[in-house]
């Protein structure tokens, strides 16, 4: 049977094509450095195919190696804020289950107003990813300036 | 039938492996902020497998979710010039058809001389991606400093 | 036969899913600008599935188009040190075989302390990738701040 046909007959999830791209919903209350995300076609170009959101945090549904990527832009940012309000730092990590808690990706803004990066990392079903923004500056909610996503790459 | 055999028997395009990596050809005339791209083995390490170039802009041939990535380096640049000529901003978006026009990715150079980012986004057959560089600074045409690409990820 | 079953029966390598994510081991001796990498589950979240390490440099085992990504963070760095020690530049390239030597990706730190980028590029079996960090500043060995990886995308 041709793969192209099989592709149409099988649900995509069985091919392991889990993928998500999220947009910023809101920041946390004081003392909570986490960014809260949202996704879905009704919101624009964000989506979740496989992973789910749990109180604004991304939960993985399939074991595998994932490409995790993120871009965060500070809403009001200048030479003033970027250097003086240092350190403004973004960290992406597994925040639950606690036994697997680890920082996967960390960047500081220094004199820039946007950070963007990506990495490959093994994730397991049930892992919840948190994105912590520390500092006093607020992120832009524009969907082309701030976004966060994962793509399943292989088992 | 084994997938490895099917892989050899079917044209790659039928597997949905559309991918392109482009190098900068030239900037637009005055009042046209678009970057004009080129690709193909004769030019070096750039290529188009599926997508096509239409007057230097990238046109998508297959519906799906794509990973879009870009790096642009300013040609004659120091942290001083980057901030003094602010705003130098790069935006990647769908520019045609007009009904689907939207900004997908936006970065400002601020005090840096290179921006690099990537994101997942749904694209449809016929979507043309434009990369707009606003400001007075010119981009480097070095193929390791400025490039733009897309990779089909899933339907 | 269902693809999901075929997926379980075939070794992943036969599907072309070569992938690697490396962490920094050490910098080179004086006059050697190369970064030396390491990978493997014993070290944390780094891994090699297909590609191999040859004296700390990444060697490709399968022809194809790859997504190459990197992030490097300078260890002791502020916007002041980053600009004062300018130029601190990172270049990723094919360093052997010599006949295929080429720079694939280049970024300068300017007033930032982290660079991160990614690109699609054709690589051939036997290509060895080197990452050269020029300048007097040292990179962080934290696994969430400095990493380097490749992902096979298509033939």
């Amino acid at each position: 049977q041709r793969f192209a046909q099989a592709q149409q007959q099988l649900p995509l999830e069985s091919l392991g094509w889990d993928v998500a791209e999220l947009q910023l919903n809101h920041t946390g209350p004081q003392q909570d450095p986490r960014l809260y995300w949202q996704g879905g076609p009704a919101l624009g170009r964000s989506f979740l195919h496989g992973p789910e959101l749990d109180k604004g945090q991304l939960r993985i549904h399939r074991d595998g190696i994932y490409m995790v990527h993120i871009q965060v832009t500070l809403a009001i940012c200048s030479s003033t804020t970027a250097s003086r309000h240092h350190p403004t730092t973004l960290a992406v990590g597994i925040c639950s289950p606690a036994s697997r808690s680890i920082s996967l990706l960390r960047l500081s803004f220094h004199q820039g107003c946007t950070i963007a990066s990506q990495r490959l990392t093994p994730l397991a079903r049930g892992d919840t990813l948190c994105t912590n923004l520390t500092g006093t500056l607020l992120p832009s909610r524009n969907t082309d300036e701030t976004f966060f996503g994962v793509q399943w790459v292989r088992p | 039938q084994r997938f490895a055999q099917a892989q050899q028997q079917l044209p790659l395009e039928s597997l949905g492996w559309d991918v392109a990596e482009l190098q900068l050809n030239h900037t637009g005339p005055q009042q046209d902020p678009r970057l004009y791209w080129q690709g193909g083995p004769a030019l070096g390490r750039s290529f188009l497998h599926g997508p096509e170039l239409d007057k230097g802009q990238l046109r998508i041939h297959r519906d799906g979710i794509y990973m879009v990535h870009i790096q642009v380096t300013l040609a004659i640049c120091s942290s001083t010039t980057a901030s003094r000529h602010h705003p130098t901003t790069l935006a990647v978006g769908i520019c045609s058809p007009a009904s689907r026009s939207i900004s997908l990715l936006r970065l400002s150079f601020h005090q840096g001389c290179t921006i690099a980012s990537q994101r997942l986004t749904p694209l449809a057959r016929g979507d043309t991606l434009c990369t707009n560089l606003t400001g007075t600074l010119l981009p480097s045409r070095n193929t390791d400093e400025t490039f733009f690409g897309v990779q089909w990820v899933r339907p | 036969q269902r693809f999901a079953q075929a997926q379980q029966q075939l070794p992943l390598e036969s599907l072309g899913w070569d992938v690697a994510e490396l962490q920094l081991n050490h910098t080179g001796p004086q006059q050697d600008p190369r970064l030396y990498w390491q990978g493997g589950p014993a070290l944390g979240r780094s891994f090699l599935h297909g590609p191999e390490l040859d004296k700390g440099q990444l060697r490709i085992h399968r022809d194809g188009i790859y997504m190459v990504h990197i992030q490097v963070t300078l260890a002791i760095c502020s916007s002041t040190t980053a600009s004062r020690h300018h130029p601190t530049t990172l270049a990723v390239g094919i360093c052997s075989p010599a006949s295929r030597s080429i720079s694939l990706l280049r970024l300068s730190f300017h007033q930032g302390c982290t660079i991160a980028s990614q690109r699609l590029t054709p690589l051939a079996r036997g290509d060895t990738l080197c990452t050269n960090l020029t300048g007097t500043l040292l990179p962080s060995r934290n696994t969430d701040e400095t990493f380097f990886g490749v992902q096979w995308v298509r033939p």
Epitope: S79, L138, S140, R141 | - | -
Partner: antibody, heavy 118, light 107 residues
Framework: EVQLVQSGAEVKKPGATVKISCKVS????????MNWVQQAPGKGLEWMGI????????HYNQKFKGRVTITADTSTDTAYMELSSLRSEDTAVYYC???????????WGQGTLVTVSS | EIVMTQSPATLSVSPGERATLSCKAS??????VAWYQQKPGQAPRLLIY???NRYNGIPARFSGSGPGTDFTLTISSLQSEDFAVYYC?????????FGGGTKVEIK
Amino acid sequence: EVQLVQSGAEVKKPGATVKISCKVSGYTFTDYYMNWVQQAPGKGLEWMGIINPYNGGTHYNQKFKGRVTITADTSTDTAYMELSSLRSEDTAVYYCATSGYDLYFDYWGQGTLVTVSS
Amino acid sequence: EIVMTQSPATLSVSPGERATLSCKASQNVGTAVAWYQQKPGQAPRLLIYSAFNRYNGIPARFSGSGPGTDFTLTISSLQSEDFAVYYCQQYSTYPLTFGGGTKVEIK
């Protein structure tokens, strides 16, 4: 040619709210920050706050204790400054002014005089 | 907040003479200082940014110095159109603050 055209003079009673507009032309509105600056009669300049018209991000001078709200309408290329709970000491000329990554003010509006009097 | 103190409050100079205006910051602001000129009934006009860079179209007789805490605006040879009030401003940290101004008047 870059132009910032502000709305006309206003007379308000104490406790009222004033909203001043600043319409820009000659550049892409979303490319620069917009600031508002107060100048009381015969006095110096006081920075009130800033907005990024592209994403709506704002930062205010705490001296105005939550009384100031700056907004931007990208469909009309217009920035607004609203000052509430007006008192007599708010009598001043209010300027809009653009800035880039470095927060100096390169283009200014002509100013709007607000008089607060009972 | 950073306090910017300008001196003198008034400077009387004859046309053609040199004028030196001082601005002191209460803490180090690097080169994040701008100078403005304001004439009666007009909006301020940017002269100098980043302590010593002349803005587009500003005559060469205007120059600035810094960095740190002590800043100076020098007008090498005063012209009739230069008699006005001059303000310094720091943009090193929020809130952005201005000096109280120096009035340059005809002697």
